[in-house]
């Protein structure tokens, strides 16, 4: 899977969208690795 900064950000956006935004506050692009997905 793509793990560039842009890919990580888009993947996290999709995850937040699907979860309705109900995730931890520190779950942000710069504080997660590709393994978080």
């Amino acid at each position: 899977a793509c793990d560039t900064a842009t890919c990580v950000t888009h993947r996290l956006a999709g995850l937040l969208s699907r979860s309705g935004g109900v995730v931890k506050n520190n779950f942000v692009p710069t504080n997660v690795g590709s393994k978080a997905f």
Partner: antibody
Amino acid sequence: EVQLVQSGAEVKKPGASVKVSCKASGYTFTDYYMNWVRQAPGQRLEWIGVINPYSGRTTYNRKFKGRATLTVDKSASTAYMELSSLRSEDTAVYYCASLLIRPHYFDYWGQGTTVTVSS
Amino acid sequence: DIQMTQSPSSLSASVGDRVTITCKASQNVGTNVAWYQQKPGKSPKALIYSASYRYSGVPSRFSGSGSGTDFTLTISSLQPEDVATYHCQQYNFYPYTFGQGTKLEIK
């Protein structure tokens, strides 16, 4: 309102260095990566590198590795791009850009900083 | 590095026309492609991400498609304010790379 406000135009001599700043506001600066891109006259956009403002970790386009240095001042929500050993081919508009999720899912760009390298 | 080849490099079309710009990657980049619009003297403005998703606020006449190596940006009905240069970008691999741009003019 999200804003990326860059420093003003610079004129430099060949061999000198330039440091461009990008002041972020309207979002949590350390949550999102900051990219730097340049556009020389009549040329395609060219990616310089990216910095994680939370950790300071950088990834560079190898074309610029050793000449470009990306840094941040977290307390000032400001990113910096320094380019050394300038040559005429470095004459370009330099942009900072950050892809955000919050407050709005959008790819924001600074207004650009013109760097002219001339003897 | 991945080469992104855009075509055409310039085109002229009439208001209301359907306009298609293509971008070919030198290797498979999945759907990790963005499209930007740049007006003279301005910063690029993001239109499309992940090959086919429009950012909020981007008019619905702009659409993107493609995967792998072949990508397309379509303007379904050209408007005067669409005069600009359009850039594709792959972000699947470092370094991110851009197409050479397509300059769009009104006939």
